[in-house]
């Protein structure tokens, strides 16, 4: 099939002991190979500080996955989610304020 770029959205969990979990979700993409990783101040986070979901079919012939990491509350602006898919790439900031999220479709 032809390339379908991912929808990427970044969300924050509730605060716990001064920490929040930020999750970057990519959905509705094809083919299944995708790079999704967190950066702090532009530097890639190590694998041992991130958690990944499997790349799974979403029932529409496309795929979905996620990556999460735990950060200190108030440092959200230092973190970005980086995505590479089929020769395209994008960087997605953590939303300011837990009630908001960013949603972006790559072309």
């Amino acid at each position: 099939g032809s390339t379908v770029p991912p929808m990427v959205n970044v969300t924050c969990s509730e605060v716990s002991e001064g920490n929040i979990t930020v999750t970057c979700r990519a959905s509705s993409f094809y083919p299944r190979n995708i790079t999704l990783t967190w950066r702090q101040d532009g530097v890639s986070l190590s694998h041992n500080t991130q958690q990944w979901g499997d790349v799974l079919p979403d029932g529409n012939g496309t795929y979905q996955t996620w990556v999460a990491t735990r950060i200190r509350q108030g440092e959200e602006q230092r973190f970005t989610c980086y995505m590479e898919h089929s020769g395209n790439h994008g960087t997605h900031p953590v939303p300011s304020g837990n009630s908001h999220h960013h949603h972006h479709h790559h072309h």
Partner: antibody, heavy 120, light 107 residues
Framework: QVQLKESGPGLVAPSQSLSITCTVS????????VNWVRQPPGKGLEWLGM???????DYNSALKSRLSISKDNSKSQIFLKMNSLQTDDTARYYC??????????????WGAGTTVTVSS | DIQMTQTTSSLSASLGDRVTISCSAS??????LNWYQQKPDGTVKLLIY???SLPSGVPSRFSGSGSGTDYSLTISNLEPEDIATYYC?????????FGGGTKVEIK
């Protein structure tokens, strides 16, 4: 067919800088990371750093002050520059494509390497 | 940095032998481990990724296993073209680091 080929000066004088080019074919630099790895004679492999599809870089902190990695997407070339070379920088320098898929991160295709000797 | 140790720097085996190469990490690396083969001419090839996954084109006589800090590469039936040096590499924590290598020779 994915290929990477390094080209370098061969010989560099101590305290001078090193510039190596990695020319790739068979894939787009906008969608893949490329790593630099070196190997001193008779020793093991050492990761130097990498450049991502968007041009962002990560470096080995032990060498970060002397290293710079850049690229020209249109020419399919990646550039390694290292300053203040000493004799222990004598090594074979490799570029390698990085595949980074969730829990998996590996260097799936390597160039043949270019030998750099630091000597006066 | 995480230190990767391959205690056996070289080994000699007969054609058809089962050969096991060990690698240990200075701390747990969550299966974030790859193996590479370097031929005498310097050519480097990916053999195993994420502890036990085999890239396409790599013969099934190669296999990997392990967990925590201890990992191994097994060649089930040594062939002449397997004469090479084998390196483990962790990517749990930046920078990625390699073991010192194990050179496999024919008896």
């Amino acid at each position: 067919q994915v290929q990477l080929k390094e080209s370098g000066p061969g010989l560099v004088a101590p305290s001078q800088s090193l510039s190596i080019t990695c020319t790739v074919s068979g894939f787009a630099l906008t969608g893949s990371g490329v790593n630099w790895v070196r190997q001193p004679p008779g020793k093991g492999l050492e990761w130097l750093g990498m450049i991502w599809g968007d041009g962002n870089t990560d470096y080995n902190s032990a060498l970060k002050s002397r290293l710079s990695i850049s690229k020209d997407n249109s020419k399919s070339q990646i550039f390694l520059k290292m300053n203040s070379l000493q004799t222990d920088d004598t090594a074979r320098y490799y570029c390698a494509r990085g595949a980074h898929y969730g829990k998996r991160w590996y260097f799936d295709v390597w160039g043949a390497g270019t030998t750099v000797t630091v000597s006066s | 940095d995480i230190q990767m140790t391959q205690t056996t720097s070289s080994l000699s085996a007969s054609l058809g032998d089962r050969v096991t190469i060990s690698c240990s990490a200075s701390q747990g690396i969550n299966n974030y481990l790859n193996w590479y083969q370097q031929k005498p001419d310097g050519t480097v090839k990916l053999l195993i990724y994420y502890t036990s996954s085999l890239p396409s084109g790599v013969p099934s006589r190669f296999s990997g296993s392990g967990s925590g800090t201890d990992y191994s590469l097994t060649i089930s039936n040594l062939e002449p073209e397997d004469i090479a040096t084998y390196y483990c590499q962790q990517y749990s924590k930046l920078p990625p680091t390699f073991g010192g290598g194990t050179k496999v020779e024919i008896k």
